[in-house]
Amino acid sequence: TPEVWVQVQMEATELSSFTVHCGFLGPGSISLVTVSWGGPDGAGGTKLAVLHPELGTRQWAPARQARWETQSSISLALEDSGASSPFANTTFCCKFASFPEGSWESCGSLPPSSDPGLSAPPTPVPILRAD
């Protein structure tokens, strides 16, 4: 059964910058990745980026750059323009649509004790209930 992992890290150089990394572990070909914050896509979350392996990417503020890292993982850079960072306590969710297995989603947030530049290891996370 496919699994999705999510990790969020604060950039060491810029405390207002965060990066969300997401990956898909499983068979099938990925046809779409959707990244949202504040909850899952379609269940209270707000879309930040959509990545299609052939048609390209779309992103919405405060997303700065969405890109494929490998054939089965992506990264999304976020820029917080405000004085205080809202990202630290925010949940980020990644949904991978894979053919023919379907859609698989997981959510994550910055670990509470995170030092800038450090992040949780990219261990597989089972599909999480978000509601």
């Epitope: 059964t1 070909s29 899952p40 896509d41 053919f99 023919p100 379907g102 859609s103």
Partner: antibody
């Protein structure tokens, strides 16, 4: 409004083939996978297979891999299913259903069904 | 293949009743459980996806719950238009499989 309009009922002879259609409207056809489901009279639902309209990739239930062929025509936003070597066991209502593209992997919109009767 | 079992094939209730329909999977399906209704004319509609999320346009009297292998659909205040057959479906693995259905009738 999402709609899936299926072709009308058919009566066919044993051994023949039949090709039914499912015309999609109200959404971008290539953005959502399409499922096909069989319902024999008074019985439950059986999943036949799924097709990705974007590239035509298919995946079938082993039970139906030699019975059904799924195709799409992107220009008309239409999905097709062809059933071959028909027998009385193939008499049923066949539904197309759009994949929700969401966790749970539900089928969020369904066609009205195409009734197939196999009789000599 | 994962077997989906709806032990109650038919259920009678009165308008206004709270009705619960159950579904069991032959293995853990991690909330990848969906509920549909089929009207007597054959029309099929999605009610609940991912165990408990309400599909758009579905009245709030419908709710879903469960985890692991056991799931349920609840109709909190039965209305005449709810008379239908209800199916569960797992979206956890291929092939997708459905329960046998529970036909809901009015007393």
């Amino acid at each position: 409004e999402v709609q899936l309009q299926q072709s009308g009922p058919v009566l066919v002879k044993p051994g023949a083939s039949v090709k039914m259609s499912c015309k999609a409207s109200g959404y971008i056809f290539t953005d959502y996978y399409m499922h096909w489901v069989k319902q024999s009279h008074g019985k439950s639902l059986e999943w036949i297979g799924i097709i990705n309209p974007y590239n035509g990739d298919t995946s079938y239930n082993q039970k139906f891999k030699d019975k059904a062929t799924l195709t799409v025509d992107k220009s008309s936003s239409t999905a097709y299913m062809e059933l071959n070597s028909l027998t009385s066991e193939d008499s049923a209502v066949y539904y197309c259903a759009r994949d929700s593209s969401n966790v749970g992997n539900a089928m969020d919109y369904w066609g009205q069904g195409t009734s197939v009767t196999v009789s000599s | 293949d994962i077997q989906m079992t709806q032990t109650t094939s038919s259920l009678s209730a009165s308008l206004g009743d709270r009705v619960t329909i159950s579904c069991r999977a032959s293995q853990d399906i991690s909330n990848y459980l969906n509920w549909y209704l089929q009207k007597p004319d054959g029309t099929i509609k999605l009610l609940i996806y991912y165990s408990s999320r309400l599909h758009s346009g579905v009245p709030s009297r419908f709710s879903g719950s469960g985890s692991g292998t056991d799931y349920s659909l609840t109709i909190s205040n039965l209305e005449q238009e709810d008379i239908a057959t209800y199916f569960c479906q797992q979206g956890y693995t291929l092939p997708r499989t459905f329960g046998g259905g529970t036909k809901l009738e009015i007393i």
